[in-house]
Interface confidence: medium
C-alpha cells in the first residue's frame, strides 16, 4: 500500500486511490475509434483492434460499440471517463471486468454498447445471453 | 513479505541523465506488471511509465514520453528507469510499485523512494 509518507493529493487529475490505497495507472484499452466489423451474430466477437493505448487518465475505462444498420456494421473501441456519458448513454456497467454488451434505444440502427474497467478488455465484446447480469450466479463471479 | 527498494537519485544538472533501479522480492516479480510513480514538492502523486511482466510493452505519461525509458531484468527482480534530458520539473520523489493482479491498473505495493533534484 501507500507508504504513510506518501502525500494524496484530492485534485490531482493524474492518480486515483482506491480504498485500500491502491494507485490506479491509466488502463490499458483498445482504442481503434470506429471500424467496420464482420462481427454479427455471434455469442461473442474480437475487437480485430491492432492498437493498445494506455488511456489518458487514470479514472478512463474501456468501452466498445457495436452499430449495425442497413449499410454496414461498425465497432468503435476507445477509452472514457464514466462519469461522463458516452452517446448519450451512462457507462453503468464501468466496473465490469468483461465488455458485456446491452442494447440501447437508438432510431434507424442496432446499437449495442459496453464498458469494462480491466486491461484491454473491450477487446472481447460479448452478446450472450448467458453473461446478462441479471443471473445471481454471474453477479458473484464478476464481484468476487 | 513484498519489498521494494529504490535506489540511483541524486542531484543533477537540467539536461543530464540518471539510471533510477528497483530492487523487488517477496512475489513473483516475472508476473508481474510493474511501474513507477513520483511526488514533485508539495504536489500530488503523477503516475510515470508501467512496464508489461516480459518487459515487451510500455507506456509512458505524456511529460516523460521520448525521454524516460523504463525496462526490467526479470533474472534480477529488478526494474529500472532510466531518465534523460531532465529537467526541474521532473524534481521530486520517485517510487517504484507493483500491480496488485494481472489485468488490473491499480498498483499496491511501493517502496521508500528515492529523490530526484534537477537543479544547476
Known amino acids: 500500500t501507500i507508504p504513510p509518507h506518501v502525500q494524496k493529493s484530492v485534485n490531482n487529475d493524474m492518480i486515483v486511490t482506491d480504498n485500500n490505497g491502491a494507485v490506479k495507472f491509466p488502463q490499458l484499452c483498445k482504442f481503434c475509434d470506429v471500424r467496420f466489423s464482420t462481427c454479427d451474430n455471434q455469442k461473442s466477437c474480437m475487437s480485430n483492434c491492432s492498437i493498445t493505448s494506455i488511456c489518458e487518465k487514470p479514472q478512463e475505462v474501456c468501452v466498445a460499440v457495436w452499430r449495425k444498420n442497413d449499410e454496414n456494421i461498425t465497432l468503435e473501441t476507445v477509452c472514457h471517463d464514466p462519469k461522463l456519458p458516452y452517446h448519450d448513454f451512462i457507462l453503468e456497467d464501468a466496473a465490469s471486468p468483461k465488455c458485456i454488451m446491452k442494447e440501447k434505444k437508438k432510431p434507424g440502427e442496432t446499437f449495442f454498447m459496453c464498458s469494462c474497467s480491466s486491461d484491454e478488455c473491450n477487446d472481447n465484446i460479448i452478446f450472450s445471453e448467458e453473461y446478462n447480469t441479471s443471473n445471481p450466479d454471474l453477479l458473484l463471479v464478476i464481484f468476487q | 513479505e513484498v519489498q521494494l527498494l529504490e535506489s540511483g537519485g541524486g542531484l543533477v544538472q537540467p539536461g543530464g541523465s540518471l539510471r533510477l533501479s528497483c530492487a523487488a522480492s517477496g512475489f513473483t516479480f516475472e508476473n508481474t506488471s510493474m511501474g513507477w510513480v513520483r511526488q514533485a514538492p508539495g504536489k500530488g502523486l503523477e503516475w510515470v511509465s508501467r512496464?508489461?511482466?516480459?518487459?515487451?510493452?510500455?507506456y509512458y505519461a505524456d511529460s516523460v514520453k521520448g525521454r524516460f525509458t523504463i525496462s526490467r531484468d526479470n533474472s534480477k527482480n529488478t526494474l529500472y528507469l532510466q531518465m534523460n534530458s531532465l529537467r526541474a520539473e521532473d524534481t521530486a520523489v520517485y517510487y517504484c510499485?507493483?500491480?496488485?493482479?494481472?489485468?488490473?491498473?491499480?498498483?499496491?505495493?511501493w517502496g521508500q523512494g528515492t529523490l530526484v533534484t534537477v537543479s544547476s
Open positions: 510499485a507493483k500491480q496488485r493482479e494481472l489485468g488490473k491498473s491499480h498498483f499496491d505495493y
Open positions: 512496464i508489461d511482466p516480459k518487459g515487451s510493452h510500455t
